[in-house]
């Protein structure tokens, strides 16, 4: 038997993936656990094996279909259960009625690229990945730029309050190496959270021309 407090948190990527993390204070001795997803009106269900990510937490990804297929909508409720093997049978360790579009976390933006770079500015574009058509333009972005001698945590956040998949960074220092990251969030959903940060994009501003400032 397992005692202790348990936390079970899941997010829907808006297309075909539900990612879950289960934390349990009490020790689990080499027990096999899984997450089972049972939609309220769909003719499919799905299971994933929970794998340890720390001493007392486990994670797994429910792959519901092809990455860009719309497997759930705003009308769906999915019963999510954590099941752990106890002898010959499975014991329900945690359960929640999951509303996918109230618990969104999109995939990190991809395909970051420098469109145009100058001495003091840089235009960068990106794409969103596996985002539902339901959002239309109802997305927002946060971006940050890593300057030399600073950490990501120190980088000021730039907020784009609309679906804008580019940014023009200004007031940069000439001939300097920077890194840039962006993340995305739908406006919909009570428990919706930011996507992970994108992979950093490294770029270098152009050196200042001798004798004049560009």
């Amino acid at each position: 038997a397992v005692n202790g407090t348990s936390q079970f948190t899941c997010f829907y990527n808006s297309r075909a993936n539900i990612s879950c993390v289960w934390s349990q204070d009490g020790a689990l001795q080499d027990t096999s656990c899984q997450v089972h997803a049972w939609p309220d009106r769909r003719r499919w269900n799905q299971t994933c094996e929970l794998l340890p990510v720390s001493q007392a937490s486990w994670a797994c990804n429910l792959i519901l279909g092809a990455p860009d297929s719309q497997k759930l909508t705003t009308v769906d409720i999915v019963t999510l259960r954590v099941l752990c093997r106890e002898g010959v049978r499975w014991r329900v360790m945690a359960i929640q009625d999951f509303k996918p579009f109230e618990n969104l976390r999109l995939m990190a933006p991809i395909s970051l690229q420098v469109v145009h770079v100058e001495t003091h500015r840089c235009n960068i574009s990106w794409e969103i990945s596996q985002a539902s058509h339901y959002f239309e333009r109802h997305l927002e972005f946060e971006a940050r730029t890593l300057s030399p001698g600073h950490t990501w945590e120190e980088a000021p956040l730039l907020t784009l309050k609309q679906k804008q998949e580019w940014i023009c960074l200004e007031t940069l220092t000439p001939d300097t190496q920077y890194e840039f990251q962006v993340r995305v969030k739908p406006l919909q959903g009570e428990f919706t959270t930011w996507s992970p940060w994108s992979q950093p994009l490294a770029f270098r501003t152009k050196p200042a021309a001798l004798g004049k400032d560009t």
Partner: antibody, heavy 116, light 107 residues
Framework: QVQLVQSGAEVKKPGASVKVSCKAS????????IEWVRQAPGQGLEWMGE????????NHNEKFQGRVTMTRDTSTSTVYMELSSLRSEDTAVYYC?????????WGQGTTVTVSS | DIQMTQSPSSLSASVGDRVTITCKAS??????VAWYQQKPGKAPKSLIY???YRYSGVPSRFSGSGSGTDFTLTISSLQPEDFATYFC?????????FGQGTKLEIK
Amino acid sequence: QVQLVQSGAEVKKPGASVKVSCKASGYTFSRYWIEWVRQAPGQGLEWMGEILPGSGSINHNEKFQGRVTMTRDTSTSTVYMELSSLRSEDTAVYYCTRHYGSFDYWGQGTTVTVSS
Amino acid sequence: DIQMTQSPSSLSASVGDRVTITCKASQNVGTDVAWYQQKPGKAPKSLIYSASYRYSGVPSRFSGSGSGTDFTLTISSLQPEDFATYFCQQYSSYPFTFGQGTKLEIK
């Protein structure tokens, strides 16, 4: 096998209410949404709303908001749909149907005639 | 509300014919589309869900396809019992809505 059996035909006067029943059998009653769909004579299908018997959760078509009431009795595996303030345009066949994949099993229909 | 526009509204065909009915959604509905068959005085019968999945017991001559806004129901070789009215439906978002129907008649 899955079956949805509805109550018999009704004749009502304008302004009255009608309550149609739908008794389910052959599956776990609490687990699946029951939908209500109506069809006026010679017309298409119109979704009215749905109820999840296990929790009692309800979603309505806003067109019927305030006039339609959906309830369930888990002891008899029966769902009810009551439509109030009836008018002549509510004359239709009313169907209950289970939502699993889409609307997979249908009741036989209940004819409601609204006439003065 | 999402409008489902079916075409044609009526169709005359012969036994053995291949018939295609189309349905256009006013917004993207993914693959959350179903097809139903209805005969006079009877309740609708489910044929297809999720745009292309046949319910068990539905003959293989019935097939569905499409995603986004454009959907089709195809009957590969019409049988006498297939003459009926066919409805498409979206269940992607509330309120769920149906097409106006396609009446398939014997030529």
